[in-house]
């Protein structure tokens, strides 16, 4: 069974908590 591995960049810009809806989806699309 395939395993999904999430690779993250430590320097990736975080998403402001208020930019998320209650289901955890980000409201905006752009990074900067």
């Amino acid at each position: 069974e395939p395993v999904v591995v999430h690779i993250t960049d430590d320097n990736e810009e975080p998403i402001a908590p208020y930019h998320f809806d209650l289901s955890g989806h980000a409201f905006g699309a752009m990074a900067c």
Epitope: A16, H19, G28, M30
Partner: antibody, heavy 118, light 107 residues
């Protein structure tokens, strides 16, 4: 170039209304949260309101709730701030700002001045 | 609401000095802390976002550090164009709030 330009400021009497506009250029406006930030003469910065990219979520500072309304027209790359029941303490330079995904204000307009006085 | 307290409110320094400005949040804001520079009659300019990330085009003499409640903006070698007012801002929760500002003046 990528920019924001506010307009609509002016002199208004206490209790009056004013609508500010912010025109966005050279970026995909409908991908960004947008904010209004104000600065009273000789004072610091105060966030006023912001709006989700599709306009469905809006937040306000307590001091303007029920009096100010933020809105946007993505088809016209424009942000608005309708200000009603204006008070002397609303006198300030009003800036529109584009938010980064972290909530930082990465792009600012030059500001428009609102003076509330009789 | 989250209160942001900046110190000092003003400071005098000379060209070439190392300058440190601090910002304290009334509760933990993780790394959601941003720094701005403002000159008289101009709009603020973003210097540092997410506590330590340098905004594109900002000189590397500016740096930010901290997380949780305590944060620092450092200018490693003050230049003539750096005399201005500096503000911190939290973007952890609405209402978004700013510190009261730090005016950096010429000694």
């Amino acid at each position: 170039q990528v920019q924001l330009q506010e307009s609509g400021g002016g002199l208004v009497q206490p209790g009056g209304s004013l609508k500010l506009s912010c025109a966005a250029s050279e970026f995909t406006f409908n991908n960004y949260w947008m904010s209004w930030v104000r600065q009273a003469p000789g004072k610091g910065l105060e966030w006023v309101a912001n709006i989700k990219p599709d306009g469905s979520v809006k937040y306000y500072v307590d001091s303007v709730k029920g009096r100010f309304t933020i809105s946007r027209d993505n088809a016209k790359n424009s942000l608005f701030l309708q200000m009603n029941s204006l008070r002397a303490e609303d006198t300030a330079v009003y800036f529109c700002a584009r938010e980064r995904q972290s909530g930082a204000f990465g792009l600012w307009g030059q500001g428009t001045t609102v003076t509330v006085s009789s | 609401d989250i209160q942001m307290t900046q110190s000092p409110s003003s400071l005098s320094a000379s060209v070439g000095d190392r300058v440190t400005i601090t910002c304290r949040a009334s509760q933990s804001i993780s790394s959601y802390l941003n720094w701005y520079q403002q000159k008289p009659g101009k709009a603020p300019k973003l210097l540092i976002y997410a506590a330590s990330s340098l905004q594109s085009g900002v000189p590397s003499r500016f740096s930010g550090s901290g997380s949780g409640t305590d944060f620092t903006l450092t200018i490693s070698s003050l230049q003539p164009e750096d005399f201005a007012t500096y503000y911190c801002q939290q973007s952890y929760s609405t209402p978004l709030t700013f510190g009261g500002g730090t005016k950096v003046e010429i000694k």
